[in-house]
Amino acid sequence: QGCGEDKICQSNLQLVRARFCTRVSDTEFQPLPMDVDGTTALFALSGQPVIGLELMVTNLPSDPAQPQADGDDAHEAQLLVMLPDSLHYSGVRALDPAEKPLCLSNENASHVECELGNPMKRGAQVTFYLILSTSGISIETTELEVELLLATISEQELHPVSARARVFIELPLSIAGMAIPQQLFFSGVVRGERAMQSERDVGSKVKYEVTVSNQGQSLRTLGSAFLNIMWPHEIANGKWLLYPMQVELEGGQGPGQKGLCSPRPNILHLDVDSRDR
Amino acid sequence: ELEPPEQQEPGERQEPSMSWWPVSSAEKKKNITLDCARGTANCVVFSCPLYSFDRAAVLHVWGRLWNSTFLEEYSAVKSLEVIVRANITVKSSIKNLMLRDASTVIPVMVYLDPMAVVAE
């Protein structure tokens, strides 16, 4: 029954979607952004305990004009899932509870078999989400690859499919800057560089504050970070523009310490106006 | 950026509203941006290692506008925008590190002081 006039069950199981998702709530998932290649998902390693894998399987005729050719009932329809060491099976969810398949995994949760129906009827379509634990992902993990294989005892040639995600470690650093003041004025008389004794001789004062905040783990485990400021010290013809008097880093060194940046500013060794600090 | 006058359409700026502006407003046409990224200025990069960076750090940089250059080069200019840029870089053996929003642009507006008469 369900195998057409020739009594041979020629199914057409297709894995039409296999994409990684972020789990928003128990049954709500959001697809991960895609890499520029359009086929690889981007997974940010930033404390997500699980990742979802959205799977959509259909059993529809390959040619709607010749529906009798295939798309028959798929008996003992299954999806076999092979997980990498970095991912472990943790559960299955479906938007429609009636579509939720029975999924069983081996002892170390690296291999999963999901029963899609016996049979998975002609015209059927099922969407569900595998919930995969990310606890095995380390900073050395660069890619996630899950191998997926549909299986049935009905007549159909089936080939493995891979779902891929590129893993990156997103440093949750934010940077913001302000100038004090936001507007400057120039006036007076032209004076040569050698006439400058004190910073007050140079022109209007300006202070820049650049704040960096780290919402994640300490950077010590990941490498060394640098805060850089591109300081426009001269105009295109080589004349001074903004003269750098003092550069100090606060908070990147430990309590109360002021970090040293390179190169050193105030190369003309002008007298510092301490009232401005 | 800050404008001394009322707000205008983007790209249009006015000098501070003083009737005795040293250069006539007809002459004061240009709005110039001095920005190393556009090649209109040259930059020195101050680089500060964040040795024990757990939560936050603030870079404080004090500077002075080089008055003489502005008097010589820009006294007939309507307004100048000076751009300072800052970013974070991370050196790591980890290949798949990614920084998002790791740069910022800080503009400052510069005008000929309307309160002062320029001495030649």
Epitope: A176, G177, M178, I180, P181, Q182, Q183, L184, F185, K205, K207, T211, S213, Q215, E248, E250, G251, P255, G256, K258, R275, D276 | E1, L2, E3, P4, Q7, P16, R55, A56, A57, V58, H60, T104
Partner: antibody, heavy 119, light 108 residues
């Protein structure tokens, strides 16, 4: 929820001392310059003091003449104001306020704590 | 130290437009920020920078700047806008903050 809660206000005699505290929650306290602002009864707002992220840069209103000391404990997410040699004119509601990173603006304020200096 | 001057009181008819001004030498160099304070409550930031509104502040509030004067404009004033409004900026030293004396807005 981003919140600042002041405490430590009360009645104190002229010449006395008081230490105000401000407990921060809901944000990375150590990333922000913090301020104290006060408001005498029926009067306007007056800036008192500011402290940078780890306390390297501290500023006070000129009128305070070294009687007040601002400090912070980032491990406890707390801001403090030690007030000595108090005078009747220091009677006010004292607010702690967070300064936005990229602007000179106080975007988060506490509800204030009342300090009354009276004999 | 710098001073910022505000009109002590301003009134506006319901639904009309009102402008509150703030004058001071430091405003030639610094943006003003504006705060609304209702009786018994802490101040609330309404405008900062060139003309930025924090989230939750209605778009009837706007800011502008000209010379040494900053202005807060409320277009279509509502009854709930009745409050004291304060401007602030840094003083000319760049290290201190100065507040204006405040403007009491009455919505008629």
């Amino acid at each position: 929820e981003v919140q600042l809660v002041e405490s430590g206000g009360g009645l104190v005699k002229p010449g006395g001392s008081l230490r105000l505290s401000c407990a921060a929650s809901g944000f990375t306290f150590s990333s922000y310059t913090m301020n104290w602002v006060r408001q005498a009864p029926g009067k306007g707002l007056e800036w008192v003091s500011s402290i940078s992220i780890v306390g390297n840069y501290i500023y006070y209103a000129d009128s305070l003449k070294g009687r007040f000391t601002i400090s912070r404990d980032n491990a406890k997410n707390s801001l403090y104001l030690q007030m000595n040699s108090l005078r009747a004119e220091d009677t006010a509601v004292y607010y702690c306020a967070r300064r936005k990173w990229e602007h000179d603006a106080f975007d988060i304020w506490g509800q204030g704590t009342m300090v009354t200096v009276s004999s | 130290s710098s001073e910022l001057t505000q009109d002590p009181a301003v009134s506006v008819a319901l639904g009309q437009t009102v402008r509150i001004t703030c004058q001071g030498d430091s405003l030639r160099s610094y943006y003003a920020s504006w705060y609304q304070q209702k009786p018994g409550q802490a101040p609330v930031l309404v405008i900062y920078g060139k003309n930025n509104r924090p989230s939750g502040i209605p778009d009837r509030f706007s800011g502008s700047s000209s010379g040494n004067t900053a202005s807060l404009t409320i277009t279509g004033a509502q009854a709930e806008d009745e409050a004291d409004f304060y401007c602030t900026s840094r003083d000319n030293s760049g290290n201190h903050v100065v507040f204006g004396g405040g403007t009491k807005l009455t919505v008629l």
